[in-house]
C-alpha cells in the first residue's frame, strides 16, 4: 500500500477545540478507513504517490509510492 | 483561541501594488492550509488563493493569476498577499481563512480600494 | 471552472419558520460542498462541510443535503440570528462560491 502520509493541515473540523488532537496530524499515520476520492483540485499534491482524502478532517492525504516519504511523498527514503 | 488579523489594506491607483498580510495565533499555523478570500462591496464572496502548510502547493484563482503572488512565513506565523497591477474589479474585503478546501476560521478583513 | 447557483436570491421569513435554499453545481462535485453564514459586516462562518456534516458549534437546526449536483441547506425553526446570508461553496474542483441567499424578516 506504500507508505501513508497525512498533510499537516487538520480543519479541526470535527473537534470542540481546534488544537484538541481529535484526528491524528502526524505525517506517518497509518490509520485505516474514513477516507474518498481527492477533489480535483488536489490532483497533483501528490508527487511520488496517490491522494486520498481524510473525511474527519476535509484534507488531502498521501500515500506514498515506495522509497518516497513527505507529506507530498516529496523526498527520497535514503532508508529504503 | 484562533485568530487571524489582516493588515496591509488602502487605497491604491489602477495599475499599482499592495501587499496584505495575515498574522495568526492561537493554533500551530505550521500545519494548516490558509487562503486567502475576498468580497467586492455588496457583492458575494469569491476565493482567491491557497497555500499548503510548507508553502509548496499554491492554487490561484483566474482572475488574480499571474498578478498576485501569495506565500507564507510559518517562523513568523503569517501569511502574505503581493498584489500587482492592480484593477478596479480588484477592490474588496480581503480576508484571510484557515483551511485550503473549507474556511473554519476568517480574520475580520482588510479593505483594497483600486481608484484614481 | 464549476458554477454554482443559489436559489432563492433572497426571501422572507418569519421566526420559526422551515427555510430552505438550494444550491446546485454546474457538474457533479460528489459531497465536496460546504455552507456558510455572513451577517453585515462580518467575516463568513462556516455550518456545514461534506454537504451534510454540521460544523462543531452550530445549532442543530441547520442541516444540509444532497450529493452530485443538487444540495440543499435547511434550517428547520429559524431564529431571529439567523437572519443573515447564506454561501454554498464547492471544493472538488479550485474552490467557488454560489452568490449568496439573503434571509430576512418578514
Known amino acids: 500500500d506504500g507508505n501513508s502520509t497525512r498533510s499537516p493541515e487538520t480543519n479541526g473540523l470535527l473537534c470542540g477545540d481546534p488544537e484538541e488532537n481529535c484526528a491524528a496530524t502526524t505525517t506517518q499515520s497509518k490509520r485505516k478507513g474514513h477516507f474518498s476520492r481527492c477533489p480535483k483540485q488536489y490532483k497533483h499534491y501528490c508527487i511520488k504517490g496517490r491522494c486520498r482524502f481524510v473525511v474527519a478532517e476535509q484534507t488531502p492525504s498521501c500515500v506514498c509510492d515506495e522509497g518516497y516519504i513527505g507529506a507530498r511523498c516529496e523526498r527520497v527514503d535514503l532508508f529504503y | 483561541q484562533v485568530q487571524l488579523l489582516e493588515s496591509g489594506g488602502g487605497l491604491v491607483q489602477p495599475g499599482g501594488s499592495l501587499r496584505l498580510s495575515c498574522a495568526a495565533s492561537g493554533f500551530t499555523f505550521s500545519r494548516y492550509w490558509i487562503s486567502w478570500v475576498r468580497q467586492a462591496p455588496g457583492k458575494g464572496l469569491e476565493w482567491v488563493s491557497y497555500?499548503?502548510?510548507?508553502?509548496?502547493?499554491?492554487h490561484y484563482a483566474d482572475s488574480v493569476k499571474g498578478r498576485f503572488t501569495i506565500s507564507r512565513d510559518n517562523s513568523k506565523n503569517t501569511l502574505y498577499l503581493q498584489m500587482n497591477s492592480l484593477r478596479a474589479e480588484d477592490t474588496a474585503v480581503y480576508y484571510c481563512a484557515r483551511g485550503g478546501s473549507l474556511f473554519d476560521y476568517w480574520g475580520q478583513g482588510t479593505l483594497v480600494t483600486v481608484s484614481s | 471552472d464549476i458554477q454554482m447557483t443559489q436559489s432563492p436570491s433572497s426571501l422572507s421569513a418569519s421566526v420559526g419558520d422551515r427555510v430552505t435554499i438550494t444550491c446546485r453545481a454546474s457538474?457533479?462535485?460528489?459531497?465536496?460542498l460546504g455552507w456558510y453564514q455572513q451577517k453585515p459586516g462580518k467575516a463568513p462562518k462556516l455550518l456545514i462541510y461534506?454537504?451534510?456534516s454540521l460544523q462543531s458549534g452550530v445549532p442543530s437546526r441547520f442541516s444540509g443535503s444532497g450529493s452530485g449536483t443538487d444540495f440543499t441547506l435547511t434550517i428547520s425553526s429559524l431564529q431571529p440570528e439567523d437572519f443573515a446570508t447564506y454561501y454554498c461553496q464547492q471544493y472538488d474542483a479550485l474552490n467557488t462560491f454560489g452568490q449568496g441567499t439573503k434571509v430576512e424578516i418578514k
Open positions: 461534506a454537504a451534510s
Open positions: 497555500i499548503d502548510s510548507t508553502g509548496t502547493f499554491i
Open positions: 457538474q457533479g462535485i460528489i459531497s465536496y
